[in-house]
């Protein structure tokens, strides 16, 4: 509550996160024209990336384009991209939706369709739907440890969310353990009224708000965090504004002296840790 | 404008960016002593990196040092680094400018110059100028979609910069479309009074400021963002303070059971999205 | 000091860091069952990662698990993980401490111990202590250049910590050169009352606070930064809360048509640059 006689100061914060969990992934893998059921294990080094403190990312789904090489090939025949003659293809043109630069030729994409040829990483990425259900849907059971150090420099006061008395095998619960700073990802979504399984397909952004309302007067000292959760991306967003959360990255390698890459379109949850609050003192 | 009767609260913000565009790059490539004109396509996975929300980086230029291996070699003969005898070379010395540790020997760098031998990634990086014009100068035509979710927790108010009524094929313009959140990189520079082609050579930092001045009173409610742009790095900076914006990263691989790397010195624009403002309510 | 007649405004800040230095690393390397003393050089591309502006990471220590492949193997025999028969191993079980999924079989780990077999990246990571002393302990002599651009939009005032008069070969010192923005990492630790050599083993988080207390009135104008340093991670933290600072990342490659990876557990110092302060004007 506002104490008007107090000098208020905004919080200075530093965050450190640690994700734990492994996922078993089953997917169809095509090798030499034969499709087999592939399975693999993903651990933290596979599904998360060294991000900065107040944000962390957990990959929940992906689409791979393997063995791409810089050359010429037909572009992907998405809506409106097909052609019947070279007239439809403009040499040097870069369609923002396309992944390459047109050569001016209209060439066969498959037995039934023709598209403009492009200079690009080939074969170009297929614009297919993200797998449903999400490949790493079991990430719902991963946990994240959040360490938060805060400082009110004007009051020369420092504290942190983890106290020496805390138990490292706890799990946050709004009622039973509201001070525990180990969170199950599925619980975060539940608290925010969201469905993890659903969001995991396209990805999304989830806010973990840490609110410090600190009374630093010695006679009524109180300074503990309060956690709350809310979804930050717009689930009702129009296609044109890129719903969900994904990014592309590549693994480069050489084969027969030619540089190749595997392109990964990674869908996942970016968790933003938003720390705010004030310290008040007479 | 300041309404003194209102309770003001600073904004809590989360940002998500998505860059679009492809660049055609032409450069001289030397293979087996023969220099050819190389031609390649760069897409988002090649020129940008999964960074956190309120910052994104677009590579506009680069210098590559290929096939480096950990061994002994002469250091690069930059100003003041040449030697005529072993006396000039101090065993175990690490010159902050150099890329290795001196062995104590003075050895030929080429037919005319000798430098101190170092234990380093060899051959050491040549300290050559960034290519001019910049290799990815066409990044000027890339676009970035910026999604910004804001929250005033004390007023229990949340909104975002993208409204359902918005058109996903718009481009920001200060006068004609000041609420569109898709920005052409070249336009950002023009608005900030900067020359993209010039900055792209050495790199730089560009600020995209999003100002929310929100009146949350129901009778005169207003809460929309205002975008402005300013260059954040010092273009007049002395050489010793490292002008522009660049960083080095490496791609590691094995050849004949020896670990090698390709070192990339990436120049580019780091865009910092600076969100600020207040929400006021009676 | 508080001037009550002034209109105060919080600082809007952008930070750019540049780390310099090379480390000579000596470690035991086992190849084909033979252990040799390996010697290598680490430069910025090897020990630091392109992070965002207000944070940078310097790797000071590491543990490598080379040649991992997705297959079956005995899990690491940490406390309580050993078995004597298949009954002790639960098919499909994922122990949060383990790195894989149990197959239900109890198999030999070595000549004396048996553990549950897992489907995982194999051989599983050995849970061994971080090397002591730290492999990159010489990072103490690295330097970091910090560039900080600040803005008070309401007062339309911008400045930076580096002035044209500054000397690029300076090193920060609290007394002799408190405005120099090139910091030796060891000095930062010394100022914070911490031992770099000790923290380098397990890693940690160090705060570099930049405080701007700006009087923007023309008759008594003052706006220069004040630097201070404090450790942000809890050095007395219980094991269960993951003391220090480390993360795992992987380098993937193919051998004999099988994807393999080298897993690196990187320990190091994350430096958080915390910029705060106000600008006041009549």
């Amino acid at each position: 509550s506002d104490k008007l006689y107090q000098r208020k100061e905004p919080v200075i914060s530093s965050v450190h996160t640690k994700v734990k969990g492994i996922a078993e992934v089953t997917e169809n893998v095509t090798e030499g024209g034969v499709t087999k059921l592939g399975h693999s294990i993903f651990d933290t080094a596979d599904y998360t990336f060294p991000l900065q403190g107040n944000s962390f990312f957990v990959m929940t789904n992906y689409v791979k384009s393997e063995g791409q090489v810089q050359t010429l090939c037909p572009e992907y025949p998405r809506r409106g991209a097909q052609c019947s003659s070279d007239r439809r293809c403009k040499k040097g043109w870069m369609d923002p939706q396309s992944k390459g630069i047109q050569t001016g030729r209209c060439v066969p994409y498959d037995k039934t369709r023709k598209t403009c040829e492009v200079s690009a990483w080939c074969p170009t990425e297929e614009e297919k739907e993200a797998p449903r259900p999400a490949l790493l849907r079991s990430a719902e059971n991963f946990t994240v440890l959040i360490k938060n150090n805060i400082h009110f420099p004007g009051h020369n006061y420092t504290t942190r969310n983890i106290l020496p008395t805390m138990n490292g095998s706890c799990t946050f619960h709004k009622t039973w353990d509201p001070q525990c700073s180990i969170f199950r990802l599925g619980d975060i979504f539940q608290e925010a009224g969201e469905n993890f399984t659903e969001v995991a397909v396209q990805g999304g952004i989830m806010g973990i708000e840490i609110y410090w309302d600190c009374n630093l007067d010695s006679w009524s000292h109180h300074c503990r965090p309060r956690y709350s959760f809310r979804r930050l991306d717009d689930k009702n967003m129009d296609e044109s504004f890129v719903p969900g959360y994904n990014f592309r990255y590549a693994k480069y390698y050489k084969e027969n002296n030619v540089e190749k890459r595997t392109l990964i379109k990674a869908f996942g949850i970016r968790f933003d840790i938003l720390v705010f609050g004030t310290g008040g003192k007479f | 404008s300041d309404k003194l009767y209102q309770r003001k609260e600073p904004v809590i913000s989360s940002v998500h960016t998505k860059v679009k565009g492809i660049a055609e790059v032409t450069e001289n490539v030397t293979e087996g002593g023969v220099t050819k004109l190389g031609h390649s396509i760069f897409d988002t996975a090649d020129y940008t990196f999964p960074l956190q929300g309120n910052s994104f980086f677009v590579m506009t230029n680069y210098v590559k040092s290929e096939g480096q291996v950990q061994t002994l070699c002469p250091e690069y003969p930059r100003r003041g680094a040449q030697c005529s005898s072993d006396r000039r070379c101090k065993k175990g010395w690490m010159d902050p400018q150099s890329k290795g540790i001196q062995t104590g020997r003075c050895v030929p760098y080429d037919k005319t110059r000798k430098t101190c031998e170092v234990s380093a990634w060899c051959p050491t990086e040549e300290e050559k100028e960034a290519p001019r014009p910049a290799l990815l100068r066409s990044a000027e035509n890339f676009t970035v979609l910026i999604k910004n979710n804001i929250h005033f927790p004390g007023h229990n108010y949340t909104t975002r910069n993208i409204l359902p009524t918005m058109n996903g094929s718009c481009t920001f313009h200060k006068t004609w479309d000041p609420q569109c959140s898709i920005f052409r990189l070249g336009d950002i520079f023009q608005e900030a009074g900067e020359n993209f082609t010039e900055v792209a050579v050495q790199g730089g930092i560009m600020g995209i400021e999003i100002y929310w001045d929100c009146n949350l009173d129901s009778w005169s409610h207003h809460c929309r963002p205002r975008y402005s742009f300013r260059r954040l790095d010092d273009k007049n900076m002395d050489e010793s303070f490292v002008p522009g914006y660049n960083f080095r990263y490496a791609k590691y691989y094995k050849e004949n059971n020896v670990e090698k790397r390709t070192l990339i010195k990436a120049f580019g624009i780091r865009f910092d999205i600076l969100v600020f403002g207040t929400g006021g309510k009676f | 000091s508080d001037k009550l007649y002034q209109r105060k405004e919080p600082v809007i800040s952008s930070v750019h860091t540049k780390v310099k230095g090379i480390a000579e690393v000596t470690e035991n390397v086992t190849e084909g069952g033979v252990t040799k003393l390996g010697h290598s050089i680490f430069d910025t591309a090897d020990y630091t990662f392109p992070l965002q502006g207000n944070s940078f990471f310097v790797m000071t220590n590491y543990v490598k698990s080379e040649g991992q492949v997705q297959t079956l193997c005995p899990e690491y025999p940490r406390r309580g993980a050993q078995c004597s028969s298949d009954r002790r191993c639960k098919k499909g079980w994922m122990d949060p401490q383990s790195k894989g999924i149990q197959t239900g079989r109890c198999v030999p780990y070595d000549k004396t111990r048996k553990t549950c077999e897992v489907s995982a990246w194999c051989p599983t990571e050995e849970e061994k202590e971080a090397p002591r002393p730290a492999l990159l302990r010489s990072a103490e002599n690295f330097t970091v250049l910090i560039k900080n651009n600040i803005h008070f939009p309401g007062h339309n005032y911008t400045t930076r910590n580096i002035l044209p008069t500054m000397n690029g070969s300076c090193t920060f010192h609290k007394t002799w050169d408190p405005q120099c923005s090139i910091f030796r990492l060891g000095d930062i630790f010394q100022e914070a009352g911490e031992n770099f050599t000790e923290v380098a083993v397990q890693g940690g988080i160090m705060g570099i606070e930049i405080y701007w207390d700006c009087n923007l009135d023309s008759w008594s104008h003052h706006c220069r930064p004040r630097y201070s340093f404090r450790r942000l991670d809890d050095k007395n933290m219980d094991e269960s809360f993951v003391p220090g600072y480390n993360f795992r990342y992987a380098k993937y490659y193919k051998e004999n048509n099988v994807e393999k990876r080298t897993l690196i557990k990187a320990f190091g110092i994350r430096f958080d640059i915390l910029v705060f302060g106000t600008g006041g004007k009549f």
């Epitope: 087999k36 | - | 297959t71 099988v258």
Partner: nanobody, 120 residues
Framework: EVQLVESGGGLVQPGGSLRLSCVVS????????MGWYRQAPGKQRELVAT???????NYADSVKGRFTIGRDNAKNTVYLQMNSLKPADTAVYYC??????????????WGRGTQVTVSS
């Protein structure tokens, strides 16, 4: 569905060499361990050598230094190069693989065997 076919067995003189091959066919995505076992008349089946998916090898003491196991993952094939053969190496040699299947655990598969006879 999964088939293992051994080849390369036969009659050889002491001190001679043979190379056994075993090809795995079927919709197997990931073969974890591949190995060779042998069974001499009137004796139990015993391990000869195994190789993991990560190319880690393990040999019975009696064949160390003489036999070499290897695998070609692209061809789903495991080899056993047998040098300095002795009469005691006479047996039926069986190819064995195991593969982890999500939900089902580890599955073991065996070939029908190929006869190796070492005799002068």
């Amino acid at each position: 569905e999964v088939q293992l076919v051994e080849s390369g067995g036969g009659l050889v003189q002491p001190g001679g060499s043979l190379r056994l091959s075993c090809v795995v066919s079927g919709s197997m995505y990931r073969i974890d361990n591949m190995g060779w076992y042998r069974q001499a008349p009137g004796k139990q089946r015993e391990l000869v050598a195994t190789v993991t998916r990560g190319d880690i090898t393990n040999y019975a003491d009696s064949v160390k230094g003489r036999f070499t196991i290897g695998r070609d993952n692209a061809k789903n094939t495991v080899y056993l190069q047998m040098n300095s053969l002795k009469p005691a190496d006479t047996a039926v040699y069986y190819c064995n693989i195991d593969s982890y299947i999500i939900g089902a655990g580890v599955r073991d598969y065996w070939g029908r065997g190929t006869q190796v006879t070492v005799s002068s």
